[in-house]
């Protein structure tokens, strides 16, 4: 299992992971105490046939070619959590591990 | 976590799981002994903002709106394996649980 890593200077057109810092303050999300910002990353690029396919299923659907099935798209295939400190809306402050906040790898599915 | 289920008569335009039977014989894959065919399903449909989003990350990337980030796409969010009996290319026949062969749920990511 692997995926491509790119940056803003890359000329790669295929499915790739790009750096992205999410800034909660810029969103006006003041209910998040910490972190103020974090490296989230995102996926972008083209999914040519078989390139970086996560699942055998993706290949099988391409073979079967059912009505209305789009080609695979560039999407997170591995994600990880971050720890956050936040108001939970009930006047409580919670420290918790929030799943699927960081993209570690991108692929076609 | 939930997802929509549709069939060929559905008028649903949003991201949905559709039935699909994969027939290995029709593909000419004679290295697969069993099953001959199985219910794989597939995902198709539109991903309007926030609809069936699997990850908070998807929403955050939409907010941050980085260069080249496409909107979320309709993709498997829950998959399951099937047991297969197949020739492994080394004159051996193997029984194995092949992961991510069946789409159980679709969502936007």
């Amino acid at each position: 299992d692997f995926g491509l890593d790119c940056d803003e200077h890359s000329t790669e057109s295929r499915c790739c992971r790009y750096p992205l810092t999410v800034d909660f303050e810029a969103f006006g999300w003041d209910w998040i105490i910490a972190p103020k910002r974090y490296k989230a990353n995102y996926c972008s690029g083209e999914c040519e046939f078989v390139f970086l396919q996560k699942y055998p299923h993706t290949h099988l659907v391409h073979q079967a070619n059912p009505r209305g099935s789009a080609g695979p798209c560039c999407t997170p295939t591995k994600m990880s959590p971050i720890n956050m400190l936040y108001f939970n809306g009930k006047e409580q402050i919670i420290y918790g591990k929030i799943p699927a906040m960081v993209v570690d790898r991108c692929g076609c599915s | 976590d939930f997802g929509l289920d549709c069939d060929e008569h559905s008028t649903e335009s949003r991201c949905c799981r559709y039935p699909l039977t994969v027939d290995f014989e029709a593909f000419g894959w004679d290295w697969i002994i069993a099953p001959k065919r199985y219910k794989a399903n597939y995902c198709s449909g539109e991903c309007e903002f926030v609809f069936l989003q699997k990850y908070p990350h998807t929403h955050l990337v939409h907010q941050a709106n980085p260069r080249g980030s496409a909107g979320p796409c309709c993709t498997p969010t829950k998959m399951s394996p099937i047991n297969m009996l197949y020739f492994n290319g080394k004159e051996q026949i193997i029984y194995g649980k092949i992961p991510a062969m069946v789409v159980d749920r679709c969502g936007c990511s």
Epitope: - | E25, I33, A34, N83, I94, Y95
Partner: antibody, heavy 116, light 107 residues
Amino acid sequence: EVQLLESGGGLVQPGGSLRLSCAASGFTFSSYAMSWVRQAPGKGLEWVSTISSGGSYTSYPDSVKGRFTISRDNSKNTLYLQMNSLRAEDTAVYYCAKQDYAFDYWGQGTLVTVSS
Amino acid sequence: DIQMTQSPSSLSASVGDRVTITCKASQDVSTAVAWYQQKPGKAPKLLIYSASYRYTGVPSRFSGSGSGTDFTLTISSLQPEDFATYYCQQHYSTPWTFGGGTKVEIK
């Protein structure tokens, strides 16, 4: 109704050769892998060989590898087992079987006796 | 090669009895075990595949269970036509191997 009919068995001397056939009917022969399984008199079952539905892939245990060759003719709905360099320990009833996850249909078998 | 050890090698039972036959694999075979019934002078018949799936047309009194290395064939209420020899087989990886058989006889 699925039917598998083996033929070609008989008495052969050690070192000799024999070709078994299995005529299949009642199912789409070309869609299924096929196997041979044998049973020595009064003994248990032993897998001998398997061939894929299209005939591209084969598998054998070490006990027969290099001596036995499985093949098929999908146009004739027939499975074959070519047995060379036969030994006394190859004496058995040979069954052909339709293959799914397991052997789901068996023929009635043909007896091969290797003796001088 | 994977060894399949079947027990008992023979048993005597009466019509209506519950009969249990076990098979132990020498290594993990997941759920890749089949069970066959063979009567004298006849070809084996498939009863159970993938440990617990009853084959088409097999009476519901036959059931299979187990995974890993330990497997069981159970006949919930023995019928006159069930007196036969039963074999387990692993279909996990070639060379496929069979147990030595269990002969079920009339008490």
